[in-house]
């Protein structure tokens, strides 16, 4: 049970925070699934990628995404070294040169082809909301998270502590 203030303490200054380095500190491949074990899949359609949330057939291979972890500079009133650590942001890339982007105007999550340096819309603050589950908060819009709506990924505003652990913003990462 974590209050929203615990989240806001770090994310209020996200608009001003900058990535420490242009290179990620860590990268690895993982598949992404929802709290209810539906898989996040990516399909090339009409020269653009679509994102789906669906049940996979037995033995069907899960799509993998490259998770890249970047250290963020804390605002000046936050300690950024040693035992206090630096906030981590991630980018998610299911295929070369394509990254998940937050479209805040449309409240949607899209795959965009782009070159580095990546735009802020491609960065998400990582949260451990629930045991074995993570959540992705928009760097460009604190309090807004990637979530599941009508079998698609969407941006969902989290405006109270009760909603912090709502199932539709919880995701599982799996390397198998």
């Amino acid at each position: 049970a974590f209050g929203i203030s615990g989240v806001q303490k770090y994310t209020r200054a996200l608009h001003d925070s900058s990535i420490t380095g242009i290179s990620p500190i860590t990268e690895y491949l993982a598949s992404l699934s929802t709290y209810n074990d539906q898989s996040i899949t990516f399909a090339l359609e009409d020269e653009s990628y679509e994102i789906y949330v669906e049940d996979l057939k037995k033995d069907e291979k899960k799509d993998k995404v490259l998770l890249s972890y970047y250290e963020s500079q804390h605002p000046s009133n936050e300690s950024g070294d040693g035992v206090d650590g630096k906030m981590l942001m991630v980018t998610l890339s299911p295929t070369k040169d394509f990254w998940l982007h937050a479209n805040n105007k449309e409240h949607s999550v899209e795959l965009h082809k782009c070159e580095k340096p990546l735009p802020d819309q491609a960065f998400f603050v990582l949260h451990n909301m629930h045991s074995n589950c993570v959540s992705f908060e928009c760097k460009t819009d604190p309090g807004v998270f990637i979530g599941v709506k009508d079998n698609h990924l969407a941006l969902i505003k989290v405006d109270s502590s009760e909603n912090l652990c709502t199932e539709n913003i919880l995701f599982k990462l799996s390397e198998t």
Epitope: T26, Y69, M87, H127, N128, L164
Partner: nanobody, 121 residues
Framework: QVQLVESGGGLVQPGESLRLSCAAS????????MGWHRQAPGKQRELVAV???????NYADSVKGRFTISRDDTKNTVYLAMNSLKPEDTAVYYC???????????????WGQGTQVTVSS
């Protein structure tokens, strides 16, 4: 809030082995990954190996087949077994962990102070 303490570094001859350990302590709620980076004099810090909470691993090309990363979740400890060491492996080896604490859900990056590994004849 989170402390990482490395051990196991030292001076070895080429072809020999070392095993590094890194223990995490403090108000740890969830660990997402633990890994090792290294920094040689005059060079940038680089990723050596990482192991995730699900057991997935990733290695730098230069150490594949020689180094093995493993993790003991019960002790929040990560190990790096380094075999067939080469002079170019000489560096300070830093432990890195991504974790959240009991005071916040935000995942943060924590670093140890580093342990020196020197490979020389």
């Amino acid at each position: 809030q989170v402390q990482l303490v490395e051990s196991g570094g030292g001076l070895v001859q080429p072809g020999e082995s070392l095993r590094l350990s890194c223990a995490a302590s403090g108000s740890i709620r969830t660990v997402n990954y633990m890994g090792w980076h290294r920094q040689a004099p005059g060079k940038q810090r680089e990723l050596v190996a990482v192991v995730t909470s699900g057991g997935g691993t990733n290695y730098a090309d230069s150490v594949k087949g020689r180094f093995t990363i493993s993790r003991d979740d019960t002790k929040n400890t990560v190990y790096l077994a380094m075999n067939s060491l080469k002079p170019e492996d000489t560096a300070v080896y830093y432990c890195n962990a991504a974790a959240s604490t009991y005071s916040s859900t935000v995942v943060r990056s924590f670093w140890g102070q580093g342990t020196q590994v020197t490979v020389s004849s």
